[in-house]
């Protein structure tokens, strides 16, 4: 049998059953999530669930830029350091940098400090690039 690899929306990239869209425009976290949803297909800010997935994403983004942090779909909606993925994925894989997670930093970004392989928490109102994900 021939198994066709699903296609992603134009400008998105495919990896292991998921499509990813990297957007180099500035949004706060909630507007970024709403924009991801607006693309349909059940898209959300991206969940990153393994080192392999993180490495693939990091390699892709590094081809565009290496200095700007990028919103992902991890947040702390109750503001109690109880982090969860906005798409409902299980929060098992963790890749936090050593930065403090205190204050009003309740949304997660891929940090440019370690080639986008680690995450930092940041204020959700900050305007940043963002990464969307959906399963085609």
């Amino acid at each position: 049998d021939i198994i066709m690899r699903p296609s992603c929306a134009p400008g998105w990239f495919y990896h292991k059953s998921n499509c990813y869209g990297y957007f180099r425009k500035l949004r706060n976290w909630s507007d970024a999530e709403l924009e991801c949803q607006s693309y349909g297909n059940g898209a959300h800010l991206a969940s990153i669930l393994s080192l392999k997935e993180a490495s693939t994403i990091a390699e892709y983004i590094s081809g565009y830029q290496r200095s700007q942090p990028i919103w992902i779909g991890l947040h702390d909606p109750q503001k109690r350091q109880q982090w969860q993925w906005i798409d409902g994925a299980m929060y098992l894989y963790r890749s936090w940098s050593g930065k403090s997670m205190g204050g009003n930093k309740h949304c997660a970004e891929m940090s440019s400090n370690n080639n986008f392989l680690t995450w930092s928490s940041n204020e959700c109102n900050k305007r940043q690039h963002f990464l969307c994900k959906y399963r085609p």
Epitope: K25, L26, R27, N104, E123, C124, N125, K126, R127
Partner: antibody
Framework: QVQLQESGPGLVKPSETLSLTCTVS??????????WAWIRQPPGKGLEWIAS???????DYSPSLRSRVSMSVDRSLNHVSLRLTSLTAADTATYYC??????????WGRGTLVTVSS | YVLTQPPSASGTPGQRVTISCSGS????????VYWYQQLPGTAPKLLIY???QRPSGVPDRFSGSKSGTSASLAISGLRSEDEADYYC???????????FGTGTKVTVL
């Protein structure tokens, strides 16, 4: 209830530098996750966004004013400052300070009128 | 000004008035539109956020909508206290900054 109060010189000469301060009350700049913005309105005209700054100093500037504008945050005094250089009569306006949540402005200060004239 | 509005609009008490706001793909086309009301001699106030949402305290006579690169603000049941300047605004991805509309003066006849 967050309140913003702008203060400035009122009258400035052409070619000089304008310094304005926005004092924030009812909120702590470095504990609230907001940008703080400056918006101006020439007499009888529309609104123009100048710049927004986060408490950590991250700032976004209007492309048309970027070369003349700088913003800073004084977390100890809980205020935000704007500097606009090389003033001309076209910079005469009411200057407003506003809280910026990353996509909109709310609330706004009352504004302070700055006249550029010799 | 990157966003275009009609300079004026008017109506009698009780009437419905609509204000348009036209932009481009980099601002209104790909970002939320916000509306601000500026009563005479006062600072602007947020009236509509995220295209069609009203902050608490804003009467439901005010409504916003967006289609493509154009947005509109409707005031139904016009009242004398609605006499003000109205501005649309949006983030612009090309400029990486906010842009405002030219403003519309609403007069209650």
């Amino acid at each position: 209830q967050v309140q913003l109060q702008e203060s400035g010189p009122g009258l400035v000469k052409p070619s000089e530098t304008l310094s304005l301060t926005c004092t924030v009350s009812g909120d702590s700049i470095d504990k609230s996750s907001y940008y703080w913005a400056w918006i101006r309105q020439p007499p009888g005209k529309g609104l123009e966004w100048i710049a927004s700054v986060f408490y950590d100093g991250t700032a976004d500037y209007s492309p048309s004013l970027r070369s003349r504008v700088s913003m800073s945050v004084d977390r100890s005094l809980n205020h935000v400052s704007l500097r606009l250089t090389s003033l001309t009569a076209a910079d005469t306006a009411t200057y407003y300070c506003a809280r910026d949540d990353g996509s909109s402005f709310d609330p706004w200060g009352r504004g302070t009128l700055v006249t550029v004239s010799s | 000004y990157v966003l275009t509005q009609p300079p004026s609009a008017s109506g009698t008490p009780g009437q419905r008035v609509t204000i348009s706001c036209s932009g481009s793909s980099s601002n209104t086309g790909s970002n939320y539109v916000y509306w601000y009301q500026q009563l005479p001699g006062t600072a602007p106030k947020l009236l509509i956020y995220r295209n069609n949402q009203r902050p608490s305290g804003v009467p439901d006579r005010f409504s916003g909508s967006k289609s493509g690169t154009s947005a509109s603000l409707a005031i139904s049941g016009l009242r004398s206290e609605d006499e003000a300047d109205y501005y649309c605004a949006a983030w612009d991805d090309s400029l990486s900054g906010y842009v405002f509309g030219t403003g519309t003066k609403v007069t209650v006849l």
